[in-house]
Amino acid sequence: EPPTACREKQYLINSQCCSLCQPGQKLVSDCTEFTETECLPCGESEFLDTWNRETHCHQHKYCDPNLGLRVQQKGTSETDTICTCEEGWHCTSEACESCVLHRSCSPGFGVKQIATGVSDTICEPCPVGFFSNVSSAFEKCHPWTSCETKDLVVQQAGTNKTDVVCGPQDRLR
């Protein structure tokens, strides 16, 4: 009776369990009743990082110097290239696909510490009573306007992204 499931590092094809190709190799032809799975090593600048049945290897990542990237770790037939940023620059994401001089803090966050040559911008959430309505790499959270000191009342409450809106006091006639 043909198998319905295969062991680890095998795959089911034509009612038969074939061996997967090892990392660093791609599938050329499936196994048959009489032959083993045929695999071939990935070419230069290619890789496959899992046991697989892929017919094409993946291209190594290109660390584009025009984006400020350089190679941190050269790829192998089993691993992708790892990029990092030029000295003094910072990756925009975990995958490090591009670089920025320093990151900015989004609305609702203020700059706790301005970036230096060695450390990126440190952002902090604006606490109650403070706001930031801009993306910035230097601006702190600003305190809400004090309506009372202007002899006005709060017409609209502030948030971490917006200032309070002040308005005239209702005068009793």
Partner: nanobody, 116 residues
Framework: EVQLLESGGGLVQPGGSLRLSCAAS???????EMWWVRQAPGKGLERVS?????????YYADSVKGRFTISRDNSKNTLYLQMNSLRAEDTAVYYC?????????WGQGTLVTVSS
Amino acid sequence: EVQLLESGGGLVQPGGSLRLSCAASGFTFRDYEMWWVRQAPGKGLERVSAINPQGTRTYYADSVKGRFTISRDNSKNTLYLQMNSLRAEDTAVYYCTKLPFTFEDWGQGTLVTVSS
């Protein structure tokens, strides 16, 4: 395409002054926080000064505070850096850059040399 063109650098004696300009195009200048950054020979990038889009708030590195003034003219799409009381340690290539400060958003820079 973002273009930032710095000018105004040159050779100046210690104690002298220079005014750098940065002409911006390819983006809506008035919407962006702008920075001046410098790189001294053989050193890393140093953040010098920044200005918010409206030109109402500024930042200065401690090393230039009280000597440098950043400003902008949104009608001319131009950023400025007035540098007074220049010192030998201000010698560097000065670049202007815009938020979000990607590697592509840079000009060629302008060289400032302070020497007697």
